[in-house]
């Protein structure tokens, strides 16, 4: 039961995370005009990965797409790529994990197959989360660099008669959404990997062959060097799972502390 819960929770957490990554990627507020220590401008600028917007004090908002591909900074292209890779991997991971869910029966799918699929989706979620966190962090670093450069410009070269309003950009809402979403996807992926351990047999399972000895039965397991010796009247052939010593309910899930960036 604990494995199913861990797997289900991992799926839900990853689903929320990937939805967040998609939302962050589509959001326009990756960088927003820094209002601190600035004159009260009647326009508010903010930018996303795909377009830049201006919200006028009058309430009207105008957005313009980045219609050029070659003219865009390489860093922005890299961030776009990271976010898209994150979304694609996450989407594939979700698709795989749906079929891997223990609560969903698909034909006569073996537990080992489900375990492999759970692990695959878990790894995909982890990579997806890392891509999102990396993308957002690269963009944030770009903002910090530009912020301090424009701050330096504000206090130098003001010798001329005409002053210009230096528009500085700071972290937008999309960055925080991206960081949290990436973190959730990562956590979901880790949970899927943990669930996989509970689903998977530790060794390849074969039908055990029972040899009847007088007084006790010894079941030999070909391929393994373990034998289960049972005293009692049960002399029927039985499937022996190495992981059978643990029931689903007995699988322990250890609470872990996750720090959000």
């Amino acid at each position: 039961m604990a494995v199913t819960a861990c797997q289900g929770l991992g799926f839900v957490v990853s689903l929320i995370g990937i939805a967040g990554i998609i939302a962050a990627t589509c959001m326009d507020q990756w960088s927003t005009q820094d209002l601190y220590n600035n004159p009260v401008t009647a326009v508010f600028n903010y930018q996303g990965l795909w377009r830049s917007c201006v919200r006028e004090s009058s309430g009207f908002t105008e957005c313009r797409g980045y219609f050029t591909l070659l003219g865009l900074p390489a860093m922005l292209q890299a961030v776009r790529a990271l976010m898209i890779v994150g979304i694609v991997l996450g989407a594939i991971g979700l698709l795989v994990s749906i079929f891997a869910l223990k609560c969903i029966r698909i034909g006569s799918m073996e537990d080992s197959a489900k375990a492999n699929m759970t692990l695959t989706s878990g790894i995909m979620f982890i990579v997806s989360g890392l891509c999102a966190i990396a993308g957002v962090s690269v963009f944030a670093n770009m903002l910090v660099t530009n912020f301090w450069m424009s701050t330096a410009n504000m206090y130098t070269g003001m010798g001329g008669m005409v002053q210009t309003v230096q528009t500085r950009y700071t972290f937008g809402a999309a960055l925080f959404v991206g960081w949290v979403a990436g973190g959730l996807t990562l956590i979901g992926g880790v949970m899927m990997c943990i669930a996989c351990r509970g689903l998977a047999p530790e060794e390849t399972n074969y039908k055990a062959v029972s040899y009847h000895a007088s007084g006790h039965s010894v079941a030999y397991k070909p391929g393994g060097f373990k034998a289960s010796t049972g005293f009692g009247s049960n002399t029927k052939n039985k499937k022996i799972y190495d992981g059978g010593a643990r029931t689903e309910d007995e699988v322990q899930s250890y609470p872990s502390k996750h720090d959000y960036v």
Partner: antibody, heavy 118, light 113 residues
């Protein structure tokens, strides 16, 4: 058709108070930011105050800060300017104007004259 | 505060003539976000409230005759009337719409000979 009608002007003694109103019609008042602009006799235009569609933010010109209060009643489609501690230099024609694209003022009222004199 | 300087303070022209008036701001009114300058031109005929002519320095308001043209960017702006008509007799104001307080220029009075 967009219409803005100011009222409440008149003769006021220095140090006195006055409340101006601007009745709006012909547009969704609650969706637009509004301004008060004044014009002293034979002088140029001077921006006085701004209130956004949702009543926040609000901005004032330095000369009226702390003395004038701009407010609005969206259900009643009315803009207000409460003026206190009036001075002779506040004598002017007061116009209300609607905020538009480019932060421009596309529709203006006919104005209401406020005269501050002893 | 941004200071708006208009010149000349008055212009005397004959009907049909082309006329230009200038407006300079003490700070740039150009917004990099949308590549637009936040300067507006108004016309105020005697005894009337101001009327919007041009916003974003060069965008003509609907219903405004095409003889009115706005140009310029940053700090230097110009309003041009290609062929002055009798009804153009008015005071023309430029306004900073970029930084509060939204200051106006002192105006350019257009008079007919």
């Amino acid at each position: 058709d967009v219409q803005l009608v100011e009222s409440g002007g008149g003769l006021v003694q220095p140090g006195g108070s006055r409340k101006l109103s601007c009745a709006a019609s012909g547009f969704t008042f609650s969706s637009f930011g509004m301004h008060w602009v004044r014009q002293a006799p034979e002088k140029g235009l001077e921006w006085v105050a701004y209130i956004s569609s949702g009543s926040s933010p609000i901005y004032y010109t330095d000369t009226v800060k702390g003395r004038f209060t701009i407010s609005r009643d969206n259900p009643k489609n009315t803009l207000f300017l409460q003026m206190t501690s009036l001075r002779s230099e506040d004598t002017a024609m007061y116009f209300c104007a609607r905020f538009y694209y480019g932060n421009s003022f596309d529709h203006w009222g006919q104005g209401t004259l406020v005269t501050v004199s002893a | 505060d941004i200071v708006m300087t208009q010149s000349p303070s008055s212009l005397t022209v004959t009907a049909g003539e082309k006329v230009s008036m200038s407006c300079k701001s003490s700070q740039s009114l150009f917004n990099r976000g949308n590549q637009k300058s936040y300067l507006t031109w108004y016309q105020q005929r005697p005894g009337q409230p101001p009327k919007l002519l041009i916003y974003w320095a060069s965008t003509r308001e609907s219903g405004v005759p095409d003889r009115f043209t706005g140009s310029g960017s940053g700090t230097d702006f110009t309003l041009t009337i290609s062929s002055v008509q009798a009804e153009d007799l008015a005071v023309y104001y430029c306004q900073n719409n970029y930084i509060y307080p939204l200051t106006f220029g002192a105006g350019t009075k257009l008079e007919l000979k």
